[in-house]
């Protein structure tokens, strides 16, 4: 019996009945065995077929078989109800070998020409399976010449049998206080040959509760306990299971914070698996009772480990731990069933005793000493000499614990000295230098240090003076001896002040004329304002209307008198303003250099002379009465003049203060 070609030779060829295309003889038996490479099959088809037809092909036939299985027994020319002829059919081996047997019996009623067939090896597509047959691969099947291989979806690994996909279902750790876990693919059938481990790991103090939900279907056996697939639940205390079958297991209260769930499957079966909903519980903490004037949030039926609550106080109440304030309060329930912090109090906000107001006082409006939420106090300034700046002085204790004005300010009001008050009124008449009386010039400041000079009090801690008067002390402010509140130059009864800093106008050049002859002295302490010590006002924008030519100003000081000595008593003189051109002309003739009188200066005095300020008066104020406000303001600062004070045709020259308001305001606000 010819064997035909075997792999690795090329596997293709032709088969024919003996004597083909002539008729075949009786009593013939011929057998061919065809072998293809592994992973290949054989394909066979007939190009000619003419055999004696007999019932069930008992006489002459061609039999095709593959292994133990007969693929076909063929005879005749065309198929009948009980016999088969190949026609145009193609036949395939089941494996890599195909046996072809030809047989003829002892007689033929007429001549038959037999058969001719062609065969070839072809790749088997192992991935294609007949309906009802098990798939080649669990997940993905990949055919290739001579074979195939399987692969798995993400989350699975190929089993060592090379066909089954085992689930990668171990190492999952659940740390939330509740959750769900299920068999892989649930509710679809779970994978074969898998071993899954799930861990629930909660903080110490929690106890895990397991509930099987929806459906439970794990392969079982009628006699043996879960021999195929099973689910086991392990805690540090005990083991539950194994579980299998179709009945939902009962709730499991593990009394443990750690649970390990193991699920093992074998190579067969088609079951949907299981689903667990887990929750946890812990020892509850005492129910939090909100303190008076406070409330708890969130409100819960019970509070267990890790649960928390916060306390919020009503408006006007604050969180206090004893005397200590808290911005917020949150307590957390601990594993032993106690709260981690003690309950605070919601105490009414207490703004505390209000701060003292310099040069003012405070009155309790709500009640004596009442300083709690919504209490009202009233600040006021010492009458006559101080006035309240910015607000009305009414303050309320607000919920933030601060006394707050109606404008929302938390800082104290300011009692600002009233400026420009004098015991003296002017009749407008020019008369000779006179002795000042108490309260006439309460802004007058005596400056001693090297020479005698003067200045004028601004506010309660600044002195306005001439730059040339304090130039030598600009780097040693503490050397200035500043006295106020006295009429007598040599009197031991005066208010002493000391300088903190001296600010000389940056445009002033010493010994090169007197342009910008202005300076400010900052005192190291505020002075107390009274009838003898009162600041002078700075000129308003409208002040020029009170400083026109021939308007009367008043200069005061302890400077040289007609007798040539410094005055013992404060003296003053009322003098008119001189036309600026007239004054400029007066100082253009020698010995005065051209341009001595600038736009930053004003002149005052009599053409006939006799009324003037003199050496020792430098830095003092030339003041004017603002008839609208009835307050005195500084229009000029005693600066320079003729060598002979009060000389006819010459005038006293004063720094024009209104030109320096921005400079003064900047320095005072900056320092």
């Amino acid at each position: 019996t010819p064997l035909g070609p075997k792999w690795p030779e090329p596997v293709f060829g032709r088969l024919a009945s003996p004597g083909f295309p002539g008729e075949y003889a009786n009593d013939q038996e011929r057998r061919w065995t065809l072998t293809a490479p592994p992973g290949y099959r054989l394909r066979l088809y007939f190009t000619h077929f003419d055999l004696e037809l007999s019932h069930l092909c008992e006489y002459d036939f061609v039999k095709l078989s593959s292994g133990a299985k007969v693929l076909a027994t063929l005879c005749g020319q065309e198929s009948t109800d009980t016999e088969r002829a190949p026609g145009k059919d193609t036949f395939y081996s089941l494996g890599s070998s195909l046996d072809i047997t030809f047989r003829s019996d002892y007689s033929n009623e007429k001549p038959f020409t037999g058969f001719e067939a062609f065969y070839a090896a072809e790749d088997i597509d192992e991935c294609q399976v007949a309906p009802g047959e098990a798939p080649t691969c669990d997940h993905h099947c990949h055919n290739h010449l001579g074979g195939f291989y399987c692969s798995c979806r993400a989350g699975y690994v190929l089993h060592r049998n090379k066909r089954t996909c085992s689930a990668l279902c171990s190492g999952q750790v659940f740390t939330q206080r509740s959750g769900e876990l299920s068999s892989p693919e649930y509710p679809r059938p779970y994978p074969k040959l898998s071993s899954c481990t799930y861990s629930i790991s909660l903080e110490e103090g929690f106890s895990v509760i397991l509930d099987f939900v929806e459906s439970f279907d794990v392969e079982t056996h009628p006699e043996t306990l879960c021999p195929y697939d099973f689910l086991k639940i392990q805690t540090d205390r005990e083991e539950h299971g194994p579980f299998c079958g179709k009945t939902l297991p009962h709730r499991i209260e593990t009394k443990s914070n750690t649970v390990t769930i193991t699920f093992v499957t074998d190579e067969s079966g088609d079951h949907t698996g299981w689903k667990i909903h887990y929750t946890s519980t812990a020892q509850p903490c005492p129910y939090p009772m909100a303190p008076p004037n406070g409330h708890v949030s969130p409100v819960q039926a019970k509070y267990i480990l890790k649960d928390s609550f916060s306390i919020f106080c009503e408006t006007g109440y604050e969180l206090l731990q004893g005397h200590l304030p808290l911005k917020s309060f949150t307590a957390v329930c601990q594993k032993d069933g106690s709260w981690d912090r003690p309950m605070p109090a919601c105490s009414i906000v207490d703004c505390g005793p209000p701060d003292d107001l310099p040069s003012g006082r405070v009155e309790y409006i709500t009640g004596p000493g009442v300083t709690t939420y919504k209490a009202v106090i009233q600040y006021s300034c010492e009458e006559t000499f101080y006035t309240m700046k910015v607000n009305d002085g009414k303050y309320v204790c607000e919920a933030d614990g601060f006394w707050t004005s109606s404008k929302g300010e938390k800082s104290l009001p300011v009692c600002e000295p009233v400026c420009g008050l004098s015991a003296r009124t002017t009749g407008g008449r020019i008369y000779g230098g006179q002795k000042a009386k108490p309260g006439d010039f309460p802004w007058q400041v005596l400056i001693l240090g090297g020479t005698t000079a003067a200045g004028a009090l601004l506010y309660d801690n600044w002195v306005l003076t001439a730059a040339h008067a304090v130039y030598e002390q600009k780097h040693d402010a503490s050397a200035l001896d500043i006295r106020m509140g006295t009429l007598k130059r040599l009197s031991p009864h005066y208010t002493q002040a000391w300088s903190e800093a001296v600010f000389i106008h940056e445009g002033y050049t010493h010994d090169a004329g007197f342009d910008n002859d202005i300076a400010l002295i900052k005192l190291n302490n505020k002075v107390v304002i009274n009838s003898n010590i009162t600041p002078i006002c700075l000129p308003r924008k409208e002040a020029e209307s009170f400083m026109r030519t021939d308007d009367i100003g008043t200069a005061s000081g302890w400077g040289l008198t007609q007798r040539g000595f410094l005055a013992r008593n404060l003296m003053y003189v009322d003098i008119p303003i001189v036309d600026h051109q007239k004054c400029t002309a007066a100082y253009e003739k020698p010995p005065y250099p051209r341009g001595s009188v600038t736009a930053n200066m004003l002149c005052a005095g009599l053409e006939s002379g006799g009324k003037d300020s003199c050496r020792g008066d430098s830095g003092g104020a030339l003041v004017f009465l603002d008839s609208e406000t009835e307050r005195w303001f500084v229009g000029g600062i005693v600066s320079w003049g003729s060598m002979n004070c009060g000389e006819a045709g010459q005038y006293g020259v004063y720094t024009k203060v209104i030109n320096y308001i921005p400079w003064i305001e900047n320095i005072i606000s900056d320092f």
Partner: antibody
């Protein structure tokens, strides 16, 4: 990790003012709590001087009220102690501490002497 | 001012023993009491606040109890590192006040 660190002069003359700084790291002084100054005299007696709260409100020991001021600079996360008119009785180690004293600084030693 | 009295200035104990430090307030302070430990050359360290709440990081051999006027700090299983001075403090009312201290010595 929250830390408090005191800084100051070490030596001050009688009648002068004492100024100390507490620098806080790892926690904002406006977030919560009271921020205290406490001193410990030779012999270990402790005295609470006062606090400034998260909101800037102050509370002082009445025995020091006329001389003490506690302020803060929120941009630098610092709070300050000023004690005026010091005497030799103010010689002590000065600590800053949070709230009831859950965190303390290392302390700074002050000697008042002419 | 509320006076916090620590009547025992010095207490002797042995390693492994249990010791109780007491503090008495001159008036009711609720539970607003803290306990501090101060080792030589160091700043005080809070052990207990609100009478019985242990500060974080404090070993559980330190426990506090009491309310109103009588307070106790108990150290069970005393260790050699517990050699220190212990202060109580009330933070109930202004001014906050401290006890004079109790020194613990290890025999």
């Amino acid at each position: 990790q929250m830390q408090l660190q005191e800084s100051g002069p070490g030596l001050v003359k009688p009648s002068q003012s004492l100024s100390l700084t507490c620098t806080v790291t790892g926690y904002s002084i406006t977030s919560d709590y009271a921020w205290n100054w406490i001193r410990q005299f030779p012999g270990n007696k402790l005295e609470w001087m006062g606090y400034i709260s998260y909101s800037g409100r102050t509370s002082y020991n009445p025995s020091l009220k006329s001389r003490i001021s506690i302020t803060r600079d929120t941009s630098k996360n610092q709070f300050f102690l000023q004690l005026n008119s010091v005497t030799t009785e103010d010689t002590a180690t000065y600590y800053c501490a949070r709230h009831y004293g859950d965190y303390w600084g290392q302390g700074t030693t002050l000697t008042v002497s002419s | 001012d509320i006076v916090m009295t620590q009547s025992q200035k010095l207490m002797s104990t042995s390693v492994g023993d249990r010791v109780s430090v007491t503090c008495k307030a001159s008036q009711n302070v609720g539970t607003n009491v803290a306990w501090y430990q101060q080792k030589p050359g160091q700043s005080p360290k809070a052990l207990i606040y609100s009478a019985s709440y242990r500060n974080s990081g404090v070993p559980d051999r330190f426990t506090g109890s009491g309310s109103g006027t009588d307070f106790t700090l108990t150290i069970s299983n005393v260790q050699s590192e517990d050699l220190a001075e212990y202060f109580c403090q009330q933070f109930n009312t202004n001014p906050l006040t401290f006890g004079s201290g109790t020194k613990l010595e290890i025999k």
